[in-house]
């Protein structure tokens, strides 16, 4: 499955929107900084097959979409930017979904790497618990926004996998 060119375009647009969503100076939130431990070591040390990369990317975007679809998120961000950001994520999910569906019929690839799916889920669990602990404060959301931007950039190794022929 070849992901449409629009996918990397959507990814860039999502990042730009996420950058625009910043409402507070990150410097005023230094006391709220937190280490979420994005599983980049696990990802970087692994040569992803295309199907694995697609599944893991889908999980990352799905979790990001869910995170920004909550009532608490709606209260934290400028509505029109949040809607545009969510739409970009939703379109990315559709692109990836179509690819995964194509592969599902095929013999299970090196098991879609459940451990990578779990690593992504645990990462978002840490983010969720942090937001709850900070009572969804504006600074907490700012820290999370910056973290999600970083995680989008970290996932370049996954994106290399997308260009690989299985």
């Amino acid at each position: 499955c070849d992901l449409p060119q629009t996918h990397s375009l959507r990814n860039r647009r999502a990042l730009i929107l996420l950058a625009q969503m910043g409402r507070i100076s990150p410097f005023s939130c230094l006391k709220d900084r937190h280490e979420f431990r994005f599983p980049e070591e696990e990802f970087d040390g692994h040569q992803f097959q295309k199907t694995q990369a697609i599944s893991v990317l889908h999980e990352m975007i799905q979790q990001t979409f869910n995170l920004f679809s909550t009532e608490d998120s709606s209260a934290a961000w400028e509505q029109s930017l949040l809607e545009k950001f969510s739409t970009e994520l939703y379109q990315q999910l559709n692109d990836l979904e179509a690819c995964v569906i194509q592969e599902v019929g095929v013999e299970e690839t090196p098991l879609m790497n459940e451990d990578f799916i779990l690593a992504v889920r645990k990462y978002f669990q840490r983010i969720t618990l942090y937001l709850m602990e900070k009572k969804y404060s504006p600074c907490a959301w700012e820290v999370v926004r910056a973290e999600i931007m970083r995680s989008f950039s970290f996932s370049t190794n996954l994106k290399k996998g997308l260009r690989r022929k299985d």
Epitope: S55, H58, E59, Q62, Q63, F65, N66, S69, L93, L96, E97, V100, I101, V104, M112, E114, D115, L118, R121, K122, F124, Q125, R126, T128, L129, M132
Partner: antibody
């Protein structure tokens, strides 16, 4: 509000198969993995596996790989679990439970379907 | 797989008594992924405590959870009749996800 509807009971003959359903409502079906859990009478809970309704990918507990097959039908917002080659060991209540994070992990369960395997 | 052992299997407590249920993991579980569920006969399990120590919505404040590594516990500071139920610990720190065999808590 989030609801997962499961039929109350299924009576099946040994060696046969059964397909259990779990109809979701109150949330976007494709946004959350759906899990299946087994509970034998008076016993603990066993995780069978999970499926992402968005694209149909599955992750199984090795112990159930040859027993259970998880599928979804997005048009009817329903998750299914097929159990094959049934024996008395498979007589149990089977629950579906929605994934999520933090306080949403397994926060929503179906009522469970009691499967009785009997000649 | 991570085996979760719960003890005792069955216990009874008088109203007002302090109760502690334990869950021991065969290998280390990160506390963020250790959950507790309450189940009453004929019903599906209910999320009771998430990430070791956080009470789920609607759970009375007399309940608390603690622990780390391989040792976790659920405590009721003062037993009430409505607390009589089975309690299961659960981990999703690694595949396959597992549940403890449960502790059945009865009221004296």
């Amino acid at each position: 509000q989030v609801q997962l509807q499961q039929p109350g009971a299924e009576l099946v003959k040994p060696g046969a198969s059964v397909k259990l359903s779990c109809k979701a409502s109150g949330y976007t079906f494709t946004n959350y993995w759906m899990h299946w859990v087994k509970q034998r009478p008076g016993q603990g809970l066993e995780w069978i596996g999970e499926i992402n309704p968005s694209h149909g990918r599955t992750i199984y507990n090795e112990n159930f790989k040859s027993k259970a097959t998880l599928t979804v039908d997005k048009s009817s917002i329903t998750a299914f679990m097929q159990l094959s080659s049934l024996t008395s060991e498979d007589s149990a209540v089977y629950f579906c439970a929605r994934g999520g994070l933090g306080p949403a992990w397994f926060a929503y369960w179906g009522q469970g379907t009691l499967v009785t395997v009997s000649a | 797989q991570i085996v979760l052992t719960q003890s005792p299997a069955i216990m009874s407590a008088s109203p007002g008594e302090k109760v502690t249920l334990t869950c021991s993991a065969g290998s280390s579980v990160d506390s963020s992924y250790l959950y507790w569920y309450q189940q009453k006969p004929g019903s599906s399990p209910k999320l009771w405590i998430y990430s070791t120590s956080n009470l789920a919505s609607g759970v009375p404040a007399r309940f608390s959870g603690s622990g780390s590594g391989t040792s976790y516990s659920l405590t009721i500071s003062s037993m009430e009749a409505e607390d009589a139920a089975s309690y299961f610990c659960h981990q999703w720190s690694s595949y396959p996800f597992t549940f403890g065999s449960g502790t059945k808590l009865e009221i004296k």
